[in-house]
């Protein structure tokens, strides 16, 4: 019951905590279970006991085995077992399952990946992070204290993350690596009253007569997959298809984007060869879903050609 699995790589530091707890002032004795041989407390030894901690500096494959710790409280001798396995370093990039720590899940709101076991070590920044053996670079990744923060998490961020740090013991440095899987979970979706991001209400759009013009209607409807959501343009309160002006067309299909995790739709209105009469029309961007409809109105105004004369 009071047994704990610990693992590490040869030539790296490994520190194991006794699975039985007690106050820092309690004496803790460590033994190598197979031989019942006491683990020394002198720090000059490669493997030594330091209170509730057993330190392998560095670890060797031959250190593998079961270690017994006895916490001597005022009332009881509490016995625990540490099952230690030291593995040879892999030549390739793959981290085998037996070296993986518990999987963590993240989402757009919470994307912290803690470096496993780091609290046992005397480490100093920086903490290095790798994903699938590649060093993480870019502003989306921030190493903060003992964890990695990923901004704007996407499903592609799922994978195996390795943290690497240096443990210092009496001036000597030892490398430590630890790997865990990160999965990205979809946050629960929700729906809200449409929010039109563009155009602004009663916007005046400058156009040049004889040139082409594009108007974009963009709205967001909530988070996750939306059951019913649409954006469209109307001319003088009439659907584009019913208005009967072939120069003015809505872009076929709706472009779905996820801005900041929100489900948003765009619809582009294309006006070819802008004419004077187009300036007299009322252009309505409509966004609708199960909550209702929101309308933003745009009007066109003539853009004065730039006067190049001095």
């Amino acid at each position: 019951k009071f047994s704990k699995q610990s693992w590490g790589l040869e030539n790296e530091a490994l520190i194991v905590r006794c699975p039985r707890q007690g106050k820092p002032s309690y004496t803790v004795d460590w033994y190598y279970s197979q031989t019942n041989k006491s683990i020394p407390t002198q720090e000059r030894n490669r493997v030594f006991a330091s209170g509730q901690l057993l330190k392998f500096l560095p670890a060797a494959v031959a250190d593998s085995g079961i270690y017994t710790c006895i916490v001597r409280s005022p009332t009881f001798n509490r016995t625990g077992y540490a099952n230690v396995t030291i593995y040879k370093k892999q030549s390739d990039c793959n981290v085998p399952d037996y070296l993986m720590y518990s999987t963590v899940s993240g989402s757009e709101k919470n994307s912290k990946i803690y470096c496993p076991t780091i609290d046992l070590y005397n480490w100093t920044a920086p903490l290095e992070w790798f994903k699938n053996c590649q060093a993480l670079q870019g502003s989306r990744y921030r190493a903060h204290k003992s964890f990695l923060v990923i901004d704007n998490v996407m499903t592609e961020d799922a994978g195996d993350y390795t943290c690497k740090f240096i443990h210092n013991e009496n001036g000597a440095n030892y490398s430590v690596t630890a790997t865990r899987s990160f999965t990205v979970k979809d946050e629960q979706g929700f729906s809200l009253f449409p929010v039109i991001g563009a155009p602004a209400q009663n916007e005046i759009k400058e156009v040049e007569i004889g040139k082409n013009a594009n108007l974009t209607c963009s709205a967001c409807f909530g988070k996750g997959t939306q059951f019913l959501a649409a954006v469209l343009w109307q001319l003088n309160g009439t659907k584009i298809t019913d208005f009967g002006e072939p120069r003015i067309q809505q872009e076929e299909g709706q472009n779905q984007s996820f801005s900041n995790g929100l489900a948003c739709l765009d619809m582009v209105l294309r006006i070819a060869d802008v004419k004077e009469e187009d300036l007299l029309l009322q252009y309505d961007c409509l966004a609708l879903n199960l909550h209702g409809l929101r309308r933003h109105t745009v009007r066109l105004s003539r853009k004065n050609p730039i006067d190049h004369h001095s």
Partner: antibody, heavy 121, light 106 residues
Framework: QVQLVQSGAEVKKPGASVKVSCKAS????????MYWVRQAPGQGLEWMGA????????AFNQKFKGRVTMTADKSTSTAYMELSSLRSEDTAVYYC??????????????WGQGTMVTVSS | DIQMTQSPSSLSASVGDRVTITCSAS?????MHWYQQKPGKAPKLLIY???KLASGVPSRFSGSGSGTDFTFTISSLQPEDIATYYC?????????FGQGTKLEIK
């Protein structure tokens, strides 16, 4: 939440024995040691002993050694304290108590409601 | 056995007063814990490991000290603080409590 519920009050004659029970809930019974403390009327607190429910190991205040027996039933998450050869000075409220946590096993954060044991001829 | 001597054994103070109780151990201890007990109730842990506030305990309670001399303080006495207070050590067997300090309101 952690709860310790003790058995009801007892009246005993001198020389008899009393067995007080303490049913634990809200945590894994075998993960924490159970301690027994008593308090005579108008007096202070006195530690009697402890049991590790996982192993059955016990530890006692020398004052009570030979007279007190502590046991634990893992199947019902219940600890028992039996005090024999009762005398009038054993009249007290008997408490079972559990430590704050295993890192702070010498401070008692959880207490039973107490069992009044009266020893009278 | 380590003997624990609390002083005073009783004290009377007014609401809002700063109240200090001391506990002296007959030999050096690592930690001191403090409990509050109201009539007919089980003791309640207030301070553990000399100075750490137990969960849900108001911040007006505090503890300090080391070695053989320890102090428990209520920064501003409240009517609900009327109780008996005990110190406790377990650096060596047996675990021992102080004899208690009974606190009353003037």
């Amino acid at each position: 939440q952690v709860q310790l519920v003790q058995s009801g009050a007892e009246v005993k004659k001198p020389g008899a024995s009393v067995k007080v029970s303490c049913k634990a809930s809200g945590y894994t019974f075998t993960d924490s040691e159970m301690y027994w403390v008593r308090q005579a009327p108008g007096q202070g607190l006195e530690w009697m002993g402890a049991i590790d429910p996982e192993t059955g190991d016990t530890a006692f205040n020398q004052k009570f050694k030979g007279r007190v027996t502590m046991t634990a039933d893992k199947s019902t998450s219940t600890a028992y304290m039996e005090l024999s050869s009762l005398r009038s000075e054993d009249t007290a409220v008997y408490y079972c108590t559990r430590a704050f946590d295993n890192d702070n096993d010498d401070a008692f954060a959880y207490w039973g409601q107490g069992t009044m044991v009266t020893v009278s001829s | 056995d380590i003997q624990m001597t609390q002083s005073p054994s009783s004290l009377s103070a007014s609401v809002g007063d700063r109240v200090t109780i001391t506990c002296s151990a007959s030999s050096s201890v690592n930690y001191m814990h403090w409990y509050q007990q109201k009539p007919g109730k089980a003791p309640k842990l207030l301070i553990y490991d000399t100075s750490k506030l137990a969960s849900g305990v108001p911040s007006r309670f505090s503890g300090s000290g080391s070695g053989t001399d320890f102090t428990f303080t209520i920064s501003s006495l409240q009517p609900e603080d009327i109780a008996t207070y005990y110190c406790q050590q377990w650096s060596s067997n047996p675990l021992t409590f102080g004899q208690g300090t009974k606190l009353e309101i003037k």
